[in-house]
Amino acid sequence: VTGSRVYPANEVTLLDSRSVQGELGWIASPLEGGWEEVSIMDEKNTPIRTYQVCNVMEPSQNNWLRTDWITREGAQRVYIEIKFTLRDCNSLPGVMGTCKETFNLYYYESDNDKERFIRENQFVKIDTIAADESFTQVDIGDRIMKLNTEIRDVGPLSKKGFYLAFQDVGACIALVSVRVFYKKCPLTVRNLAQFPDTITGADTSSLVEVRGSCVNNSEEKDVPKMYCGADGEWLVPIGNCLCNAGHEERSGECQACKIGYYKALSTDATCAKCPPHSYSVWEGATSCTCDRGFFRADNDAASMPCTRPPSAPLNLISNVNETSVNLEWSSPQNTGGRQDISYNVVCKKCGAGDPSKCRPCGSGVHYTPQQNGLKTTKVSITDLLAHTNYTFEIWAVNGVSKYNPNPDQSVSVTVTTNQAAPSSIALVQAKEVTRYSVALAWLEPDRPNGVILEYEVKYYEKDQNERSYRIVRTAARNTDIKGLNPLTSYVFHVRARTAAGYGDFSEPLEVTTNTVPSRIIGDGANST
């Protein structure tokens, strides 16, 4: 049974005489008169089992003491630490010729753990041990002892175990403690890679290459390797591991990000606080969830704040100029926390009688600089119809507008374009032709461009070639032209007038009056 004594983490103790409870019971040769096991009290009044010999009066001493079998435990090189006290020969009366101040240390490798006798010739000498000048003074009970510490190493070892032996040649000495240990590079974590307990190499200059394994919740960046030096120190760390997304390095471990923190990638960064307007409710978050009403665009980094669509643009002003409209507005009060704001223009043409019945304006309308993705707060809209109700919506949009289920970020204005001269009348028809009259009818212009005040019919005899013509005005879309000559070709033109003026005349309609008193009904543009 051994008591616990604390030694460096890179040393593995195979034997510690001071930890043994009760007698050590090592083998001495000769059995009597040589090495003797003696119990002394340490500074805590705890008994220490020591071996002493003090045969200083007789020459040619050869007293051997052998330990029990010591297992090697896979170590190729072991270290022997001997704490001993040596009495100066000059403190012993009358022994100058026979007293020595050294002893010898030996070892013998063996697979047999039960060898009963000391066979001196089997042992290999490690060294002659002498009292060092630099001794430690230790309180043993009430007595100050000069305690020397010597460490020797031996290797390479190959058998299952070994025995140590101490040869006294005539010194007055006590072995206060014998400790046998090997060195290992202790289990360690470096650069987030764990390196296992590794026994040092066989010789004092060897380096053992060890591959590390990434700690939990981490992954290799470069293959982690270290070298275990002969002194049990890890050397030259190469490569490393990185904490997985959602984890950060804390105390050599990859620990989950705390609630309210996140880490998006496998990097050496620490977890970051969730960006504004986002949260994480679990440990180990790789991203943070946006607050209600806030969104993250596809190309937004996880580190960016969650944002929301902008509010509606402000202060929309319209300026109508005949069939053009200039619109200007101010930026929204709330941009949603984004810089990528732009504006889209929606144009709707609405009926005068029922403004709710609107339809898209179509492709004939033109926008300067553009209809969608406007970066400025003004737009010019041209090629509108005159005297038409239009509703224009200005939409403020940003990178997250598409995620908003309830858009409310537009402002609208309804305008009516100015009246203009109407377009020409497309179709004029002779409805009834007699010897002396022609009944005309026509359609409203395609684009009245205002309220039609009247229509003007211009006609003349064909052979006069417009040198002499007559004008008839009517508010209706038909008229009877009377007082014509029979069997004569007439040319008719019709135009409409609004408050803005006359439109262009229609294409000519040629009609010939009849010779007989009968009716000729004509649908065409040219009745004969």
Epitope: E32, G33, V38, I40, M41, Q52, C54, N55, V56, M57, E58, P59, T85, L86, R87, L92, P93, G94, V95, G97, T98, I140, G141, D142, R143, I144, C172, I173, A174
Partner: antibody, heavy 121, light 106 residues
């Protein structure tokens, strides 16, 4: 078993000599020094000195020089105390004791049974 | 010559009690002090050497301490066979004994 065996009691007249033997057994005689201790009747212990059994070199305590001689016969593992010109005040038990040197300290670890020397006219 | 003075001269104790004996040196003897027990009609027996080290075979109820000039021998629980005279002895260049302390039954 380590033993020191001393001779029986001696009665001597003043002026005579006595040689007290101390035979060692159970250990190598020449490996340990031998000490001599006197104890007068009813009194305490008095160290007389010691002899190096390897070299034969004696050391005498104050008051035990001149008439007191330590000697050896290593062939029979025996140490001797010889007192000459005995006086009445030499009446005492004389002990031989093996000297033990250790790294922690010295002491007399094995004692003879003692020889009573009586000096009387 | 170094003089050792033991006290008390006589110590009366009952079996099972603790006994404490003192030895004072006229000058420092470091740890070079031994204790002996002598029973009537017997040779002394070595109890302690080096001020505090017990030889093999000495019961652990005997313990000792001290260095320099003041030394103590303690019998933790006195047994009937412990009633005897106890001597301290210093072994500097010249050895001397104290005058002894008699431990008797109370």
């Amino acid at each position: 078993q380590v033993q020191l065996l001393q001779s029986g009691a001696e009665v001597k007249k003043p002026g005579a000599s006595v040689k007290v033997p101390c035979k060692a057994s159970g250990y190598t005689f020449t490996s340990r020094a031998m000490s001599w201790v006197r104890q007068a009747p009813g009194q305490g212990l008095e160290w007389m000195g010691w002899i190096n059994t390897n070299t034969g070199n004696p050391t005498y305590a104050q008051g035990f020089t001149g008439r007191f001689v330590f000697s050896l016969d290593t062939s029979v593992s025996t140490a001797y105390l010889q007192i000459s010109s005995l006086k009445a005040e030499d009446t005492a038990v004389y002990y031989c004791a093996r000297v033990r040197f250790t790294v922690y300290g010295d002491g007399m670890d094995v004692w003879g049974q003692g020889t009573l020397v009586t000096v009387s006219s | 010559e170094i003089v050792l003075t033991q006290s008390p001269a006589t110590l009366s104790v009952s079996p099972g009690e603790r006994a404490t004996l003192s030895c004072r040196a006229s000058q420092s003897v470091s740890s070079n002090l031994a204790w002996y027990q002598q029973k009537p009609g017997q040779a002394p027996r070595l109890l302690i050497y080096g001020a505090s080290t017990r030889p093999t075979g000495i019961p652990d109820r005997f313990s000792a301490s001290g260095s320099g000039t003041d030394f103590t021998l303690t019998i933790s629980r006195v047994e009937p066979e412990d009633f005897a005279v106890y001597y301290c002895q210093q072994y500097g260049p010249s050895w001397t004994f104290g005058q002894g302390t008699k431990v008797e039954i109370k």
